[in-house]
């Protein structure tokens, strides 16, 4: 008969809290007669995990049927893993004896370490909105993972970004680790519909990375362009003037009409038209009364967008003599 060898193939076993861990042990001989036991740790303080011979171990099951004579597999499964289960596990063969069985040979041990999954990455954008062509920073954080090795990538609309810095803490030994990464993203005018994605890959995720996203719509402000135009047709003694507010984001917009410097109408944007790129358009109409006394009317369309400084566009109203006559004719 060959000399008994206790084989524990894994030096390190990563397990996740709540899952089941399988600890492998095979023997090369059935001799000597006696049980196989599993311990955590070594020396007099070692903890009995499983005894083939006796005892009640509710969390432990054997992988193979130990009642079969030719069985040489003494692997066990431990269910509902908790952080308290970490340590080095030894498969030990005993020789039948009295008053106690005699330890005959031990396996080399398998270290069980907590392979904690990282939390879902949380991506935070800048506190304030920024206009296109500027650079904004996004942070991505994930916590509670182990071991320390982890991979983090950034994407913008599926394209991998390269301008980012990542830190994993703590630098020394720990039960769990955290990762924080900051990416710098240059905003484009069309980024209202864009997304940044933070992707975290870890050994506990079995090749299925976790992703956190942030919409650039939360970070971007596209300022409007204004165009004020006088409509050729008039209604009675009134001329219609429009202020077209184009390509702005977000929706928040207040518009003020002034006539020769005097405020005469305030509006809050509603019933907006959405563009393909996610920006909005809005048109405001203003009716100006025409009379003989009014030769030089200057209209101003002033827009305050998303709490920023107001922008305005002026229009000097063109009132022809013919229009004045028409207007006079129409006056009762």
């Amino acid at each position: 008969e060959e000399e008994l060898q206790m084989i524990q193939p894994e030096k390190l076993l990563l397990v996740t809290v709540g899952k089941t861990a399988t600890l492998h042990c095979t023997v090369t001989s059935l001799l000597p007669v006696g049980p196989v036991l599993w311990f955590r740790g070594v020396g007099p303080g070692r903890e009995l995990i499983y005894n083939q011979k006796e005892g009640h171990f509710p969390r432990v099951t054997t992988v193979s049927d130990l009642t079969k004579r030719n069985n040489m597999d003494f692997s066990i499964r431990i269910s509902s893993i908790t952080p308290a289960d970490v340590g080095t596990y030894y498969c030990v063969k005993f020789r039948k004896g009295s008053p106690d069985d005699v330890e005959f040979k031990s396996g080399p041990g398998t270290e069980m370490a907590l392979g904690a999954k990282p939390s879902a990455p949380v991506v935070l954008g800048p506190a304030a909105r920024t206009t296109p062509e500027h650079t904004v920073s996004f942070t991505c954080e994930s916590h509670g993972f182990s071991p320390r090795d982890i991979t983090l990538k950034w994407f913008k609309n599926g394209n991998e970004l390269s301008d980012f810095q990542t830190n994993v803490d703590p630098t020394g030994q720990s039960v769990a680790y955290s990762i924080r990464s900051t990416a710098r993203v240059v905003l484009d005018p069309w980024d209202v519909r864009s997304q940044v994605i933070c992707e975290v890959a870890h050994v506990t995720l079995q090749g299925d990375p976790l992703r956190g996203t942030a919409n650039l719509s939360e970070a971007i402000r596209v300022p409007p362009t204004l165009e004020v135009t006088q409509q050729p047709m008039r209604v009675g003694n009134q001329v219609n003037v429009t202020c077209q507010v184009r390509k702005f984001y977000p929706q928040s917009l207040q518009l003020t009409w002034s006539e020769n410097g005097n405020v005469c109408q305030r509006e809050t944007a509603s019933t907006l038209t959405e563009n393909k790129d996610g920006t909005y358009n809005w048109t405001s109409w203003f009716l100006v009364n025409i009379s003989d006394q009014r030769d030089d009317v200057v209209l101003t369309c002033q827009v305050k967008h998303d709490g920023q400084l107001a922008v305005s566009k002026r229009l000097a109203l063109e009132v022809t003599v013919h229009q004045k006559d028409q207007s006079s004719d129409a006056t009762p």
């Epitope: 007669v33 083939q52 130990l66 004896g97 009295s98």
Partner: antibody, heavy 118, light 107 residues
Framework: EVQLVESGGGLVQPGGSLRLSCAAS????????MHWVRQATGKGLEWVSA???????YYTGSVKGRFTISRENAKNSLYLQMNSLRAGDTAVYYC????????????WGQGTMVTVSS | DIQMTQSPSSLSASVGDRVTITCRAS??????LAWFQQKPGKAPKSLIY???SLHSGVPSKFSGSGSGTDFTLTISSLQPEDFATYYC?????????FGQGTKLEIK
């Protein structure tokens, strides 16, 4: 089905010899420690001999030097060669299988009667 | 050799009774103790090994306990088929030895 069937018992004169056989079915005999146990009429059980998986042999004091335990793997059989038989060897002889890891007896044969008498 | 002593040698009981048989070893045998049941004219049947583990197919009314030198076999509720002779056996070291037996009879 796991089974042990003994044969070879009978009447023999003191000083004579007898060879008991035990045919195993349903398992590989060589993978187990195997035993012979005897029981005199109206008496208790007495362990007689054992053979380990490595071929190591063991005997109770009263039969040492007279009895020989062996096995034939090809026939999946166990044997007990009994020489210099005495009246005190008269008993039913049982073939017994030892347990998987601790050698606890689990399977018993039906027994074969050996009578040593003149 | 390790001596095994059973008590009582015989025991009368009624159907439904709970009975306990004890077995004492002359030295520490760890828990390498087995119990067997034998009916007249039949081969012994293995009931318990390592003092408290039931062989497959053995009803749970049989239970064993003990370690070291003192052991017990308990039958929780006697049925007619349980009246037989019971033997304990140490198998920690050769020569394996049996107790003298306890004959359980119907009262």
């Amino acid at each position: 089905e796991v089974q042990l069937v003994e044969s070879g018992g009978g009447l023999v004169q003191p000083g004579g010899s007898l060879r008991l056989s035990c045919a195993a079915s349903g398992f590989t005999l060589s993978s187990y420690d195997m035993h012979w146990v005897r029981q005199a009429t109206g008496k208790g059980l007495e362990w007689v001999s054992a053979i380990g998986t490595a071929g190591d042999t063991y005997y109770t004091g009263s039969v040492k030097g007279r009895f020989t335990i062996s096995r034939e793997n090809a026939k999946n059989s166990l044997y007990l060669q009994m020489n210099s038989l005495r009246a005190g060897d008269t008993a039913v002889y049982y073939c017994v299988r030892g347990g998987v890891w601790d050698d606890a007896f689990d399977i018993w044969g039906q027994g074969t009667m050996v009578t040593v008498s003149s | 050799d390790i001596q095994m002593t059973q008590s009582p040698s015989s025991l009368s009981a009624s159907v439904g009774d709970r009975v306990t048989i004890t077995c004492r070893a002359s030295q520490d045998i760890n828990n390498y103790l087995a119990w067997f049941q034998q009916k007249p004219g039949k081969a012994p049947k293995s009931l318990i090994y390592t003092a408290s583990s039931l062989h497959s197919g053995v009803p749970s009314k049989f239970s064993g306990s003990g370690s070291g030198t003192d052991f017990t076999l308990t039958i929780s509720s006697l049925q007619p088929e349980d009246f037989a002779t019971y033997y304990c056996q140490q198998y920690v070291s050769y020569p394996y030895t049996f107790g003298q037996g306890t004959k359980l009879e119907i009262k």
